[in-house]
Structures are given as structure tokens and as C-alpha cells.
Amino acid sequence: LPSPEGATSCECEEGFFRAPQDPASMPCTRPPSAPHYLTAVGMGAKVELRWTPPQDSGGREDIVYSVTCEQCWPESGECGPCEASVRYSEPPHGLTRTSVTVSDLEPHMNYTFTVEARNGVSGLVTSRSFRTASVSINQTEPPKVRLEGRSTTSLSVSWSIPPPQQSRVWKYEVTYRKKGDSNSYNVRRTEGFSVTLDDLAPDTTYLVQVQALTQEGQGAGSKVHEFQTLSPEGSGNLAV
């Protein structure tokens, strides 16, 4: 005989679940579908990931996202996780927003980002709901820097980057300071491939770095080089 009252709780149909913390009166729900749309936009050594929420929320509002990263070496095709070497604008697990910026990416590396959507019952199934996007980093190469000449009070420095990348650079920024003085530094900007740093102290080592400035932001910086001005006694002008 049918019971005079409805049941206090119902078993969930296949593929639907109640999370342990869900009240018995709550409807059965299921994991979300994958994030609906994912884009990865490269900007120098950064990538901005944006996605839209799953079309099917599974009947729940507690959706969070996780981002994972894989990098692949173009020469060998080998791939591996890159969580240790990149930096996220916020912790990449348990995200509630639908965007994140990933920085410190390496030039000429291929990256694949996976964004997974989860809700309160995702842990009750083995399948995952995710979408992936790949991006190649084409940040400019670090400039190769040379000391062309020096005097007691100046250093002439030149640099180069591969010709195909030169058209992307609108200026170069040369930062220099006395070795041992980390409190103050000087910056020179130039459109050319060389600069003479004047008004320097004799017989002194300077730390010099060159960085390309592109439309996307800063290119990779050069090594920090140590160049030394001539001492007053052994000075021939601009000798190397």
C-alpha cells in the first residue's frame, strides 16, 4: 500500500549525487560540465587565461576552478609540469573567478593550460570536467651585450638580438649602477644598438643590463654584465 506521506529523502538516480554535507531535502546534483570557453592570450612572458562558466552547473552553485600547467620543449617534444617555475596572479586551485594571469613563462617554450571545473559532488566521480588551451611564448630573446670601448670615465656598450625580432622592439632600456651600490641606479633609453655611458668613476666596476621594450611590454632582460672603467694611470681613450 502506498504510504500516506511522501518519503523524507529520495535515492539519487544514476549520475546524480548528494554531497556528504548536503541536507537530505536537497535535490540530487551532478558534477558540472567543462568550462564553456577558454582563451589564452600571450603578452611577452605572461599569459592571461579567461574562461566562461560551464553551461551545465550540475544544479549547484559551489563551482570552483583549478588551473594546471604543462610545458613542452620544442626541440625534443618532451613535456612536464611547470607549476614550480611559473607564477600565478592568485592561487591556481579553488578559484572562484573566471580568469587568472600566469607569468614568468620562458621564451620559445610551448605551454598547455588546463582549467577544470568542480563542484561539491565532483569528488564522487572519477571523470573530470576540463578544457585546455595551448600557447607558444615568443618573447624577444635577451640582448647579447658587449663592451666596445672604455675610458677612465665612460663605457661604450653595444648589443644585438636576432634580426627577425628587431622589428618588435621600439626602444632598449640600459640600466647601470656601481658595483656594490645597490641603492641607486641609472637608466638610459635608446632606439639604437649601442650607448656610451658617461660621467663614470675611474677604475670602477659597473653592473650593466639591457632590456628590450616591445608593444607587449618588456622583453627578456640581458645578463647583468660587469664592466670596468680604466684607471687614470693606464688610460688610453676608449681602449678595450
Epitope: P142, L147, R150, L155, K179, G180, S182, T205, L207, Q209, A220, G221, S222, K223, V224, H225, E226, F227, Q228, T229, L230, V240
Partner: antibody, heavy 127, light 108 residues
Framework: QVQLQQWGAGLLKPSETLSLTCAVY????????WSWIRQPPGKGLEWIGE???????SYNPSLKSRVTISVDTSKNQFSLKLSSVTAADTAVYYC?????????????????????WGQGTMVTVSS | SYVLTQPPSVSVAPGQTARITCGGN??????VHWYQQKPGQAPALVVY???DRPSGIPEQFSGSNSGNTATLTISRVEAGDEADYYC???????????FGGGTKLTVL
């Protein structure tokens, strides 16, 4: 080919001063900054400091208050003194030569790679 | 002070490629040097200036460095490559030399 030979006391009591010397054979002593490096048992490498022919030094900040590195250009030798030792100073101590002269034609190499090492001296601090 | 971070251990099968990383803030702007140390021996330089090899070091040792990570790559790994590996840089901000904590390479 440059060779490094080092010597000094291997067993010390706490609060004593560690003293090691490294002799450089071959090569141009005056062109390089000469370093001391240590390695506690089962642990990693730790740079202690460096000296050049004129006695100019640079030290690891964590040891600076206890370290003195000096040079004797007449003998092509440099020495390490570490005062007030404790058991934490127990380690193999190495002297080392950088790969390139410190400065050549205005281009300098601080903290260059070390291509030649001494044989190492095990120093034990124990009461 | 400047810190270099290495994984404590890396395991690889013979004939495979081992990658040992060395992480540090903007390490790409510094020259990174790598050493191999076998038990009871002094360290031996295997790569300098990110990717150059001293004479006598086989081609299977190579290096790269950009951003915040430098990598020592050992291709076609053999049993004789089992050792501890250390990275090293000069920190120009504090004017002192820094070693990574070391990575033990195990050949399975």
C-alpha cells in the same frame, strides 16, 4: 695546469679558531679571486668567501663576523681563519680557483665557475 | 639574501633524459654554473655560463636558463652519471656567491 694543495688542523675544540692554507701551483696567481667553500657531512656546498692578490675580500654574510681570508703573494698562498668554531662548523673545507681571470679588458666575472678545487680538508669540531 | 631552489632528488632510467632545475628570482639575468659531485670527491664543473661545457665534458650535458628557472639536462643517462648536482650563481645585489641545495640523481 693549476693545482691547489691545502692543509691545516683537522680536529678542533669548540671556541677555537680554524686555520687552513691553500697553495697555488702554476698559473697566474694575481689574476684571480681565490675562494673557500665548505660542505658539512651529508649536506650541500656553502661559499665562505674570496680574496685577490691585493687582499681585497668578499665574505658570505652568514659567516662574515667570524671569517678572515688573507693572502701571501710571495708564496702564492691564501689562508682561511674561522673563529669561535662550534660543532656546526664541522665540514670538508675546499679551496677553489675560478674558471677565468677576474677582469680581462674591462669585462669582469664575479662569482665565476670554479674549475679547479683543492683535495678538501675534513675539519671536525668536538669537545 | 638570494635563494636557489633545487629538487632534492631526481630519478631516471638508463638511456632516458634527466632534467634538474634550479629556481631563483629572475635567475635568467645571472650566469648559472653546474657541478657534479660523486661520493668522496670534490665537485667537478660540468656546465658554466648557463650552457657552455668545459673541455672534457661530454655533449650529453647541456643547460638552459631563462625567467626564474635554470635547467641542467643530461641526455642518454648512464649509471656513471649518478651523483649530486649543484647550481651556482653570483648575487650582484649582495655581492656574494650562492649554491643551490643540491639534487641527488638516481639512475634506476
Amino acid at each position: 695546469q693549476v693545482q691547489l694543495q691545502q692543509w691545516g688542523a683537522g680536529l678542533l675544540k669548540p671556541s677555537e679558531t680554524l686555520s687552513l692554507t691553500c697553495a697555488v701551483y702554476g698559473g697566474s696567481f694575481n689574476d684571480y679571486y681565490w675562494s673557500w667553500i665548505r660542505q658539512p657531512p651529508g649536506k650541500g656546498l656553502e661559499w665562505i668567501g674570496e680574496v685577490n692578490h691585493s687582499g681585497s675580500t668578499s665574505y658570505n654574510p652568514s659567516l662574515k663576523s667570524r671569517v678572515t681570508i688573507s693572502v701571501d703573494t710571495s708564496k702564492n698562498q691564501f689562508s682561511l681563519k674561522l673563529s669561535s668554531v662550534t660543532a656546526a662548523d664541522t665540514a670538508v673545507y675546499y679551496c677553489a680557483k675560478p674558471f677565468r681571470p677576474h677582469c680581462t679588458n674591462g669585462v669582469c666575472y664575479s662569482g665565476d665557475a670554479f674549475d679547479i678545487w683543492g683535495q678538501g680538508t675534513m675539519v671536525t669540531v668536538s669537545s | 639574501s638570494y635563494v636557489l631552489t633545487q629538487p632534492p632528488s631526481v630519478s631516471v632510467a638508463p638511456g632516458q633524459t634527466a632534467r634538474i632545475t634550479c629556481g631563483g628570482n629572475n635567475i635568467g639575468s645571472k650566469n648559472v654554473h653546474w657541478y657534479q659531485q660523486k661520493p668522496g670527491q670534490a665537485p667537478a664543473l660540468v656546465v658554466y655560463d648557463d650552457s657552455d661545457r668545459p673541455s672534457g665534458i661530454p655533449e650529453q650535458f647541456s643547460g638552459s636558463n631563462s625567467g626564474n628557472t635554470a635547467t641542467l639536462t643530461i641526455s642518454r643517462v648512464e649509471a656513471g652519471d649518478e651523483a649530486d648536482y649543484y647550481c651556482q650563481v653570483w648575487d650582484s645585489s649582495s655581492d656574494h656567491l650562492v649554491f643551490g641545495g643540491g639534487t641527488k640523481l638516481t639512475v634506476l
